[in-house]
Interface confidence: low
């Protein structure tokens, strides 16, 4: 799997999952989340030769497609995979509010 | 929607989805395929600003991110997300073989 | 930074062979493609072939059988091998990478980006 | 197999004057954009100046621009400078060709 297990310990070109911190008040503007301050998102990049880690039957075709004619503009992209919820603190007024957003850190990567 | 509908009529450098045809014995080198010949697999490309057509919250976030911080490498990627299957005939020696593809055509794109 | 140095060129006599290397170094050659692209004295720009980041090779129509593009990605090089070479080979050949668009392979356009410096080569006896 | 045919063969003008080279191609380019325009200075490699018909690339002054779809391109310098001496070169991707690109025969670009 393209997680943190095999792409932080590698170092690799191909897609894999990338180290990502966001402090959500200088990265994102947002104020209003109390706690944390930020969190490892994590994302995804890299390239997506033929047959690594392909989603999809059409992505298998497209990788292939993208190796006969590297000049196209068509070829799978490096996306999340695995995704997991972030919990978080916020306050309304002067009630604090504990939410867990959903799809928020990456986990793993795959090629769409 | 990010489908034929809309991106076959629109100019559009965002994420849209994309014509692309696909000549099996040319553009892959697929010779076992009888017929068809070739198939409209379609394709995603364009940019992911932020609140286009996101997925996720991460890609909502990620988006936000690269607005604030557009030197960065980490941005949502235009991908497929309603796929289609393709029938195609084939031969085992002299016999016809009719099967089904699974996810050969894209019908719509998202941001990831 | 992203760099391409051939090297390898010289003189050649008519009928022999060459191999020319271009070394490329701050990118991975299984994410990118690398052209040939070659330029006679006072003369213009023609491309020789490449090969993919998927190690597919590819060739004008004029170079096939003659010129054959290799890589080896352990040693970041790609090679030319040239045969049979003429007087009309003479020239300033060029290694060049396929531009990458968002930090992926998405599409080059005929977009060459960065070039080598060129290594010249003359076929003379 | 492709040709791309510039005009002018050469170009003098005078500096601060416009300057404008057309590339004629005898088949479309693939997806109608896939046209590069390069520069080259005595005894240096080629530039890219600018890929898909009109996107400058990074570095690039924004004097110079691209513009045509299909078979017929140009490309612009609004206010000529004395660094703008040079060859300028076309070139087209092709999709099903043997030749996969292409390179008009160049324009040279001289002070008046």
């Known amino acids: 799997a393209l997680d943190a297990a095999y792409c932080f310990r590698n170092v690799q070109d191909n897609c894999c999952l990338r180290p990502l911190y966001i402090d959500f008040k200088r990265d994102l503007g947002w104020k209003w989340i109390h706690e944390p301050k930020g969190y490892n998102a994590n994302f995804c990049a890299g390239a997506c030769p033929y047959l690594w880690s392909s989603d999809t039957q059409h992505s298998r075709v497209l990788s292939l497609y993208n190796t006969i004619n590297p000049e196209a503009s068509a070829s799978p992209c490096c996306v999340s995979q695995d995704l997991e919820p972030l919990t978080i603190l916020y306050y309304i007024g002067k009630t604090p509010k504990i939410e867990q957003l959903s799809n928020m850190i990456v986990k793993s990567c795959k090629c769409s | 929607a990010l489908d034929a509908a809309y991106c076959f009529r629109n100019v559009q450098d965002n994420c849209c989805l994309r014509p692309l045809y696909i000549d099996f014995k040319r553009d892959l080198g697929w010779k076992w395929i009888h017929e068809p010949k070739g198939y409209n697999a379609n394709f995603c490309a364009g940019a992911c600003p932020y609140l286009w057509s996101s997925d996720t919250q991460h890609s909502r976030v990620l988006s936000l991110y690269n607005t604030i911080n557009p030197e960065a490498s980490a941005s949502p990627c235009c991908v497929s997300q309603d796929l289609e299957p393709l029938t195609i005939l084939y031969y085992i020696g002299k016999t016809p073989k009719i099967e089904q593809l699974s996810n050969m055509i894209v019908k719509s794109c998202k941001c990831s | 930074e992203q760099q391409l140095v051939e090297s390898g060129g010289g003189l050649v006599q008519p009928g022999g062979s060459l191999r020319l290397s271009c070394a490329v170094s701050g990118f991975s050659l299984s994410s990118y493609t690398v052209n040939w692209v070659r330029q006679a004295p006072g003369k213009g720009l023609e491309w020789i072939g490449y090969?993919?980041?998927?190690?597919?090779?590819y060739y004008a129509s004029w170079a096939n059988g003659r010129f054959t593009i290799s890589k080896d990605s352990a040693k970041n090089s790609v090679y030319l091998q040239m045969n049979s070479l003429r007087a009309e080979d003479t020239a300033v050949y060029f290694c060049a990478r396929h531009m990458q668009v968002g930090g992926a392979p998405t599409g080059s356009m005929a977009a060459f980006d960065p070039w080598g410096p060129g290594t010249l080569v003359t076929v003379s006896s | 197999d492709a040709v791309l045919t510039q005009t002018p063969l050469s170009s003098p003008v005078t500096l601060g004057q416009p300057a404008s080279i057309s590339c004629q191609s005898s088949q479309s380019v693939y997806n109608n954009n896939y046209l590069s325009w390069f520069q080259q200075r005595p005894g240096q490699p080629p530039r890219l100046l600018i890929y898909g018909a009109s996107t400058l690339t990074s570095g690039v002054p924004d004097r110079f621009s691209g513009s045509g779809a299909g078979t017929d391109f140009t490309l612009k310098i609004s206010r000529v400078e004395a660094e703008d001496v040079g060859v300028y070169y076309c070139?087209?991707?092709?999709?099903?060709?043997?030749?996969?690109?292409?390179f008009g025969g160049g324009t040279k670009v001289e002070i008046k």
């Open positions: 070139a087209g991707g092709y999709s099903g060709s043997s030749d996969k690109y292409a």
């Open positions: 090969i993919s980041y998927g190690g597919s090779a």
